[in-house]
Interface confidence: low
Amino acid sequence: SGEIALCKTGFPEDVYSAVLSKDVHEGQPLLNVKFSNCNGKRKVQYESSEPADFKVDEDGMVYAVRSFPLSSEHAKFLIYAQDKETQEKWQVAVKLSLKPTLTEESVKESAEVEEIVFPRQFSKHSGHLQRQKRDWVIPPINLPENSRGPFPQELVRIRSDRDKNLSLRYSVTGPGADQPPTGIFIINPISGQLSVTKPLDREQIARFHLRAHAVDINGNQVENPIDIVINVIDMNDNRPEFLHQVWNGTVPEGSKPGTYVMTVTAIDADDPNALNGMLRYRIVSQAPSTPSPNMFTINNETGDIITVAAGLDREKVQQYTLIIQATDMEGNPTYGLSNTATAVITVTDVNDNPPEFTAMTFYGEVPENRVDIIVANLTVTDKDQPHTPAWNAVYRISGGDPTGRFAIQTDPNSNDGLVTVVKPIDFETNRMFVLTVAAENQVPLAKGIQHPPQSTATVSVTVIDVNENPYFAPNPKIIRQEEGLHAGTMLTTFTAQDPDRYMQQNIRYTKLSDPANWLKIDPVNGQITTIAVLDRESPNVKNNIYNATFLASDNGIPPMSGTGTLQIYLLDINDNAPQVLPQEAETCETPDPNSINITALDYDIDPNAGPFAFDLPLSPVTIKRNWTITRLNGDFAQLNLKIKFLEAGIYEVPIIITDSGNPPKSNISILRVKVCQCDSNGDCTDVDRIVGAGLGTGA
């Protein structure tokens, strides 16, 4: 109503009304009773006639002091306003009414009677009365989801008390009206009747916030917009849904009752704060039902599955299948909606079964001297999960093998123990081994499980006699012998031993290598005799040692043989005369500027070699006439021309060289001397002419 009136201090209404839900909560704002203060300087203080239930703040907002269910005793109370300076008092009545219960019929009924009026307030401004927005808590409209109609379904009527004077048009704005999803809420522009056009789904939109507008026929706003909140009330229209249809969990065998296994989870699209969305879980069935039909329990609120009975044994039951049910309405079987899922619980292996040998004694045989061969196959059984550390066998030899001749490897596929020989065995020393072997797993046995006697076995290993190689001892055999021995001299006896003491075989000897063919061996007794003269200076002798190898063969099946080396250390005798070195030399036709240095080559060694004596023979006389020899030291001498000139040519100069042996050995060696024309440096200039000149005799 836009009429002009003088400002009147006090409450503008005689009675204030508010429509509330049955449950009023502590601190809940109920309505606003703001005082019309024409003289803006007044300071007003508010008070409630029911201070235990209601209080009013300095802005006139009424709040509930405590939580209580709304009943007729709270239906009416008074609010007092008092001027703090003049002590002048005013009062107004407040009427509280209960919102009707939410059946579709009651919603419909309330829609027919309920009316929301644009609130009014007057204040003096510039001498005129002016309309102002007043704070007003409009209770929300509660509307159940999935209503069956008929539609449109009337909710409330929006009106302005200015419709007495003016022709007004009403509209609503906001999501659900003119914004997506559009057209859910409509308003009759003339009557202000607000209606819903279709069923609502709380799970899509749980709350609508609309604004109602009133304008005159020219489109001018005559009221401030008011907020309308529509709460969609939940119905139990959604079943619980498990996040997975099949849930997989594990639990170790032998677990104590109370062991956590897994958690299953279902969700319900309905309101989680209402019974419609409050779920409870239960186990419907367990398969298999051994050793007890109730091996597991489920926390009905959290979905945690735990063991509840002892006796989980993977070797008996490897997997349990539980059917789990989730029911809303806190699990009420009558009203609640349910769904099921499967929990598959795998019982995991622990090492609660030791490996057990399939026999108390295993037998094997091994040829002597062989290594890296499999002697015996040890077999075990283990009820734990194959090819896991609780099943994989580890074998050890606990007795009967003090020198570590055997080892046991595990065949990864069969789990068998492969007993192998790692050090050669001599039949003549050990004919049999009785090994004590133990089988364990790669991981320790579970607590409280002991190794039974069947985890230990014996392995009886028979050593097979093999025809072994005869061997010479010592090998090599070293003897010292003077060279020059005549053929037929017995040097030594070189015999071999046969390791096969029990076979009583004959050994025959043959020569294997004798580079100079100096020796023979007696095939029966191994006596070595010379068949030629031993020569220390032979190319077959290295560092005074002559090596010959011999073969000793037994008459076993198959025959075996061994080789032995005889090393003859040859002592030198003076059997080699020295020779001149070099055998060819060059000098000039005149004695200066050069001379020829010579030495001696003697294949013997000290004391049968140097120092040497060098001399020229008496015959032919031309030698001593033309040449002179001068001893430099025990090994070297110098040959020079004695005459002033000797024609270019090739001359053979005989030189007598004597060694220091006892008796000494002498030899006349020929030195070929090329005499040539020389340049100033003493180098030959006419080599070609000399070559053509032929030989002379040192003359």
Partner: antibody
Framework: QVQLVQSGAEVKKPGASVKLSCKAS????????IQWVRQAPGQGLEWIGW????????KYNEKFKDRATLTADKSINTVYMELSRLRSDDTAVYFC????????????WGQGTLVTVSS | DIVLTQSPATLSLSPGERATLSCTAS???????LHWYQQKPGSAPRLWIF???NLASGIPDRFSGGSGSTDYTLTISRLEPEDFAVYYC????????FGGGTKVEIK
């Protein structure tokens, strides 16, 4: 020097038998195992079995156990391999080889004998 | 029986390049019993490497052999024209088997 000389090529019909020889020289015949290995055209090597003249011991690959027979004549240092009930997939070059002193390697090989099985 | 798997089946390389041939045993083989042979068309195989890493008589030192637990390798440091052939690995540890061969061919 060590030599293994094998007999000449053979052409046989399916179902027939073939006997191949391998003559050894240059070493003590009774001291070494003689192996037989075959190689089908364009294929790898397949072990048939071995014969030890020293003791007469024989070992066969399970695959050939029922069809192969290994024998020897020590007087002429020769090992024989007979394969019966021939099939077309027995067409191959058959080698004899000497096993070394230790470790099981084949240190000397024959030149091979081609056996063709065809109807 | 122990299965020997050789890889690759064919190795295409140029002279001067390095070649690595692999032989994997289905179960453990003692290194003393793993050998390699070279075979050229129309010829018998020839012992090349014995006991995993020992070169047979007359084999050039550009060849070498090595091993892991069940993996064995033949390596040619620098390929020469005469090295192009098929190489077989062979075990005598349990029964007796050969690998399928690796053909080293000129790229």
């Amino acid at each position: 020097q060590v030599q293994l000389v094998q007999s000449g090529a053979e052409v046989k019909k399916p179902g027939a038998s073939v006997k191949l020889s391998c003559k050894a020289s240059g070493f003590t015949f009774t001291d070494y195992l003689i192996q037989w290995v075959r190689q089908a055209p364009g294929q790898g090597l397949e072990w048939i079995g071995w014969f030890y003249p020293g003791s007469g011991s024989i070992k066969y690959n399970e695959k050939f156990k029922d069809r192969a027979t290994l024998t020897a004549d020590k007087s002429i240092n020769t090992v024989y391999m007979e394969l019966s009930r021939l099939r077309s997939d027995d067409t191959a070059v058959y080698f004899c080889a000497r096993r070394g002193d230790w470790g099981g390697f084949f240190d000397y090989w024959g030149q091979g004998t081609l056996v063709t099985v065809s109807s | 029986d122990i299965v020997l798997t050789q890889s690759p089946a064919t190795l295409s390389l140029s002279p001067g390049e390095r070649a690595t041939l692999s032989c994997t045993a289905s179960s453990s083989v003692s290194s003393s019993y793993l050998h390699w042979y070279q075979q050229k068309p129309g010829s018998a195989p020839r012992l090349w490497i014995f006991s995993t890493s020992n070169l047979a008589s007359g084999i050039p030192d550009r060849f070498s052999g090595g091993s892991g637990s069940t993996d064995y390798t033949l390596t040619i440091s620098r390929l020469e024209p005469e090295d192009f052939a098929v190489y077989y690995c062979h075990q005598y540890h349990r029964s007796l088997t050969f690998g399928g061969g690796t053909k080293v061919e000129i790229k």
